[in-house]
Interface confidence: low
């Protein structure tokens, strides 16, 4: 108990909790927040901010807590059963295909366009054409003509769990 | 350059109270859990403390715990360690050093300088 | 709290040696094993991190091996600037624990 951590954010029966509870596995498998002892006899709790496991499981180790990269903001810390919850800062979006980096939403839209959709956590501006309504993605190459406009508020948490 | 330097050592009594500034240059502070060790005169290393990036997760030493305080200014690019009832077993050189690519799995990189604390009466 | 036990203490080599020196850890730390190295009166300098992943501007002749608890550091060819104490330090879990050291002296 000689690690015990000293988390500010939380409750104060949660700061108090040993680092390591042992039990017993229930067929074989131990409860999330926990891991299963080399012999397979116990059931071994993670530690808080440390690592993790979600799911009923009989792993040898917990899963190592996520440290949110430069460009985010934690929206939510490491718990022995949930792994840290990340999300890009404000003005910066993270897309499907390049999950590793959060990327930086365009300003505006090339001209002929209108912005419909604000910059998320998880996209970026959407921009129609004025005529047609054709969706694109704020992306625009260099040379465009943009109009600025601010980015918007993001309206729900966007979770990386890496 | 990334670079680290301490500050805030001096002769100090023992009972006596003492805060160490670690002053970071060179990235970007706010990203980085940080930490201090300590090395007492022709010893080896010992861990003292560790703080995340946003101060939400802080760890000690069983053998500073409740007398040192660390903590962190983003704002700043600044680390303290606020260190009370000093014992002449805390006499040592204090690092300041950077935490690694995790929160959890960390290593220490790169060092300051150290600022040399001493408890005597 | 997981013991970090160094060996041997010092080690008296000559400059193109081949020098190997041994961490073992108490516990299992997987690959979460860090090697320093310190001179006289200078901060430690980070050589190894993750067991065997050679810091950026360490010279190859450095190389880290090792998994579970039994790790090794070995200076291929000695240089005379790699005279200098060795540390191993465990990232595994708090708190964070080094070796006692490992001074490489000339013989």
């Known amino acids: 108990e000689s690690a015990l951590i000293t988390q500010q954010d939380l409750a104060p029966q949660q700061r108090a909790a040993p680092q390591q509870k042992r039990s017993s596995p229930s067929e074989g498998l131990c409860p999330p927040g926990h891991h299963i002892s080399e012999d397979g006899r116990d059931c071994i709790s993670c530690k808080y901010g440390q690592d993790y496991s979600t799911h009923w499981n009989d792993l040898l180790f917990c899963l190592r807590c996520t440290r949110c990269d430069s460009g985010e903001v934690e929206l939510s810390p490491c718990t022995t059963t949930r792994n840290t919850v990340c999300q890009c800062e404000e003005g910066t979006f993270r897309e499907e295909d390049s999950p590793e980096m959060c990327r930086k939403c365009r300003t505006g839209c090339p001209r002929g366009m209108v912005k419909v959709g604000d910059c998320t956590p998880w996209s970026d501006i959407e921009c129609v054409h004025k005529e047609s309504g054709t969706k694109h993605s704020g992306e625009v190459p260099a040379v465009e003509e943009t109009v600025t406009s601010s980015p918007g508020t993001p309206a729900s948490p966007c979770s990386l769990s890496g | 350059e990334v670079q680290v330097v301490e500050s805030g050592g001096g002769l100090v009594k023992p009972g006596g109270s003492l805060r160490l500034s670690c002053a970071a240059s060179?990235?970007?502070?706010?990203?980085?859990?940080m930490n201090w060790v300590r090395q007492a005169p022709g010893k080896g290393l010992e861990w003292v403390s560790s703080?995340?990036?946003?101060?939400?997760?802080?760890y000690y030493a069983d053998s500073v715990k409740g007398r040192f305080t660390i903590s962190r200014d983003n704002a700043k690019n600044s680390l303290y360690l606020q260190m009370n009832s000093l014992r002449a077993e805390d006499t040592a050189v204090y690092y300041c050093?950077?935490?690694?690519?995790?929160?959890?799995?960390?290593?220490?990189?790169?060092w300051g300088q150290g600022t040399l604390v001493t408890v005597s009466s | 709290d997981i013991q970090m036990t160094q060996s041997p203490s010092s080690v008296s080599a000559s400059v193109g040696d081949r020098v190997t020196i041994t961490c073992r850890a108490s516990?299992?730390?997987?690959?979460?094993l860090v090697w320093y190295q310190q001179k006289p009166g200078k901060a430690p300098k980070l050589l190894i991190y993750?067991?065997?992943s050679l810091q950026s501007g360490v010279p190859s002749r450095f190389s880290g091996s090792g998994s579970g608890t039994d790790f090794t550091l070995t200076i291929s060819s000695l240089q005379p600037e790699d005279f200098a104490t060795y540390y191993c330090?465990?990232?595994?879990?708090?708190?964070?624990?080094f070796g006692g050291g490992t001074k490489v002296e000339i013989k």
């Open positions: 050093a950077r935490g690694g690519s995790s929160w959890y799995g960390d290593w220490f990189d790169p």
């Open positions: 060179g990235f970007t502070f706010s990203s980085y859990s």
């Open positions: 703080i995340s990036s946003s101060s939400s997760y802080i």
């Open positions: 516990q299992g730390i997987s690959s979460w």
């Open positions: 993750a067991a065997s």
């Open positions: 330090q465990q990232a595994n879990s708090f708190p964070f624990t």
